[in-house]
């Protein structure tokens, strides 16, 4: 708390500018009008205030807006956002994606903070769902965001949002998460033609059931071995040699190099030797 003292003569701030960096904490408290600060928040970030001075400015805003800052102020907080507590942020009603982006930019290059987590939570809850534009924004700043959501949270992601997901956004997902995401992706991309569909669905196939893999094998998709190795073992086991051959196309030769690894190893053990021999790869069941 800064003690209430009268502003010295001639020091009353007419605008937020560089001259304020020479003000002591008590002078900032006494001479800067909170309403002026609120309307000129965009200037604060251009001025090299100390952390202690920023504390005073935050205190003034807190007094002006005890129920929480309006979005017009929030959007221009800049580095002052780093001074906010999760409790402060829970009072906010952030609805604009531009505001979200502006605040995520402040934390860019750093790991998730409690403040940012609270902000995202408030924003997504306010929107009612994790829509495509929001997901697009969040994964741009936090590529691991999608895979940090629980299967329960992912189940509320609308299929339309799946269009925002890039292959790298799924890199850290586990099998349980892909089980939830795959049916959504299948729904989202259902109206695409064969080759385009496969390009989009490929990253999600770690959650695909056997019947979908069988269907893909009829479409000349030429799945690469890296994708095949990420498929669910229980989904691969019932596939016939002919189906795997069709699924992989020219990449079928890669099975030899992966014969000791899952799911290839387990699949080989389920096949008749006569069938494996038709591949001409020397695979031993």
């Amino acid at each position: 708390e800064v003690e209430k003292t009268a502003c010295p003569s001639g020091k009353k701030a007419r605008e937020i500018d560089e001259s304020l960096i020479f003000y002591k904490k008590w002078e900032l408290e006494a001479c800067v009008d909170a309403a002026l600060l609120a309307t000129q928040m965009d200037r604060v970030n251009a001025i090299p205030f100390t952390y202690e001075q920023l504390d005073v400015l935050k205190h003034k805003l807190d007094e002006l807006y005890p129920q929480g800052y309006p979005e017009s102020v929030i959007q221009h907080l800049g580095y002052l956002f780093l001074k906010m507590s999760p409790e402060d942020i829970r009072k906010w009603n952030v609805t604009s994606l531009e505001t979200l982006k502006a605040l995520l930019e402040v934390n860019k290059g750093h790991e998730m903070s409690p403040q940012v987590a609270t902000l995202i939570d408030r924003f997504v809850k306010g929107r009612g769902q994790l829509d495509k534009d929001t997901l697009d924004t969040l994964t741009a700043f936090y590529p691991g965001y999608l895979c940090s959501l629980s299967p329960e949270e992912l189940s509320s992601v609308p299929p339309s949002s799946i269009w925002a997901v890039r292959p790298q956004d799924l890199d850290t997902c586990d099998p349980r998460q892909l089980d939830v995401l795959y049916p959504k992706a299948r729904l989202a991309f259902q109206n695409m033609n064969g080759s385009e569909y496969f390009v989009k669905i490929q990253s999600f196939l770690g959650g695909a059931p056997t019947e979908d893999l069988k269907a893909l094998s009829q479409q000349n998709v030429s799945m690469d071995l890296a994708t095949f190795m990420k498929l669910r073992t229980d989904a691969v086991l019932p596939l016939t040699v002919a189906e795997v051959q069709k699924l992989l196309g020219p990449h079928v030769e890669g099975l030899k190099a992966e014969e000791r690894h899952r799911p290839v190893r387990d699949w080989i053990l389920r096949q008749r030797q006569d069938d494996l021999d038709t591949l001409g790869l020397g695979l031993q069941g």
Epitope: M112, C147, E153
Partner: nanobody, 116 residues
Framework: QVHLVESGGGSVQAGGSLRLSCVAS????????MRWYRQAPGKEREFVSA???????SYADSVKGRFTISQDNARKTVYLQMASLKPEDTAMYYC??????????WGQGTQVTVSS
Amino acid sequence: QVHLVESGGGSVQAGGSLRLSCVASGDTGYQPTMRWYRQAPGKEREFVSAIYSDQTTSYADSVKGRFTISQDNARKTVYLQMASLKPEDTAMYYCKLTTRRGSEYWGQGTQVTVSS
């Protein structure tokens, strides 16, 4: 940089229990996702369990109902309580931490051996 250290492994008879711990240090960020994987001799590393940013959990079918993942309040330690252990649970158990930025970190592992 993040450092993970697992402990709690050991030898146990079938039907017995063990509790694995994984302690994280360094900048893990807020609410990282913590997962346990395991690797049996001559096999690939496989997913065992996860605890996500909202504190909900998931399990591989093979351990569901027998294993329980949990985290302490400081969020820097994750546990794997393993009960009704079977010989097929024998493996090296690894802890993995994933941050919201997508950085992944693995521990060195702790050995679990279950004899019949």
